[in-house]
Amino acid sequence: TPEVWVQVQMEATELSSFTVHCGFLGPGSISLVTVSWGGPDGAGGTKLAVLHPELGTRQWAPARQARWETQSSISLALEDSGASSPFANTTFCCKFASFPEGSWESCGSLPPSSDPGLSAPPTPVPILRADLAGILGLSGVLLFGCGYLLHLLRRQKHRPTPRLQPSHTNSQALTAQAWAPSQASQAALHDPYATINTSFCPATLDTAHPNGWASLPTHAAHQPQGPAASASTPILARGSFVSVENGLYTQAGERPPHTGPGLTLFPDCRGPRAVEGRFGVR
């Protein structure tokens, strides 16, 4: 399965509005996402938006709004001013770069038969999105847990002895059960074949940004939201050289000022193998 998926969606309310969704399924930290139309970036395509996990976004008409959906996926809203809706026949491409390991790109378009409001299947089609699987699993566990607790409480009401009260240990076990799928879905979102790994590592520590992005608008909103954002982040001192535990070493320089946390963390750093991933192309 290609590591980049692209989904083009026509909005049901406004037929002139389109949204491009793109995601990166491999491990490794994303250093830049480029969305283009008419072909791949650097191969005849025209840039629509560039999203940097730390330094913000840049977009060009007809792009309306580019934003991060998760740490590994983005969406780009497009406003089609033309009456004939040229977007319907256009190829949109998303390039995810993980510096310096490499860049991976995939393209997709709105199928001719698409009904408004229905999204085109991703390219490629995942059997079941890992994040959805996690949510469904978590919901199931929570529902089961609630039902079980209610059952116990009902039995409690009808029994004179307090012997069968739900113990503190039981409630802890339920909490743990509800928590695990959430972690699993986060891991699977980045690497569907991964074992659950809850450690975090700096996403962009191995690189320096001497210049080139100073003029970018930086919004706190662009920071990927999710468990990584709320997790307690290790404080890392700046130095001339940085050595990360999985052996990524490079010059680390001063970073331009930006809002939000100093480091964007990605929950998929699994040692030396977390860099390149399964970037197969079929």
């Epitope: 830049l32 650097g42 191969a43 491409c93 510096f99 193998r273 390149e276 970037f279 192309v281």
Partner: antibody, heavy 122, light 106 residues
């Protein structure tokens, strides 16, 4: 036509520095990273580092820590690799290469400079 | 760093024969890239991400493998295939190349 043209051969004394240039043409310079590889006479290939031409961020092989510096000049579409504190074992052909982008259903191709021979001798 | 060991160091074959070149990694890597280099020339990308042919590379070249063991196969050797072949990993920094396999005419 995509081309990477490197500067000419250099002869340097131990302890000196050398700065090799790599001029790109035939494509949008900032769309592709450039990496440097060296090859000592009769030896294999060795990755030295990569520069992101769009924002000049770099990633270096730790072996060259503190001795290698990669820069770029977008106005001339040129990347530079400077190696300092030269020693005899730095005698090699230095190549710049345009990094390839893996794009589904599109051709994947790399481009290399012709190489620059740097000789370090007293 | 991940050490890549290529075998054999030299492979002597005749045109039309099948060539099998191996690359063994000191620790598991996700993908392997293969390069071809002819005397006096810069290297050229042959295979990326283990099994995908780069642009312009003939179909007689193929790649396979996973984990620590990877293979480059040339199904039927042509005279222009005699060169040095290098494997490269990008799963861990620093990126490393194998020491090369020299494919020579028997």
């Amino acid at each position: 036509e995509v081309q990477l043209v490197q500067s000419g051969a250099e002869v340097k004394k131990p302890g000196a520095s050398v700065k090799v240039s790599c001029k790109a043409s035939g494509y949008t310079f900032t769309d592709y990273w450039i990496y440097w590889v060296r090859q000592a006479p009769g030896q294999g290939l060795e990755w030295m580092g990569t520069i992101d031409t769009s924002d000049a961020k770099t990633s270096y092989n730790q072996k060259f820590r503190g001795r290698v510096t990669m820069t770029r000049d977008t106005s001339t579409s040129t990347v530079y690799m400077e190696l300092s504190s030269l020693r005899s074992e730095d005698t090699a052909v230095y190549y710049c290469a345009r990094d390839f982008i893996i794009t589904v259903n599109y051709p994947v191709v790399d481009y290399w400079g012709q190489g620059t021979l740097v000789t370090v001798s007293s | 760093q991940i050490v890549l060991t290529q075998s054999p160091a030299t492979l002597s074959l005749s045109p039309g024969e099948r060539a099998t070149l191996s690359c063994s990694a000191g620790s598991s890597v996700n993908y392997m890239h293969w390069f071809q280099q002819k005397p006096g020339q810069a290297p050229r990308l042959l295979i990326y991400s283990t099994s995908n042919l780069a642009s312009g590379v003939p179909a007689r070249f193929s790649g396979s493998g996973s984990g620590t063991d990877y293979t480059l196969t040339i199904s039927s050797l042509e005279p222009e295939d005699f060169a040095v072949y290098y494997c490269q990993q990008r799963s861990s920094l620093p990126f490393t190349f194998g020491q090369g396999t020299k494919l020579e005419i028997k």
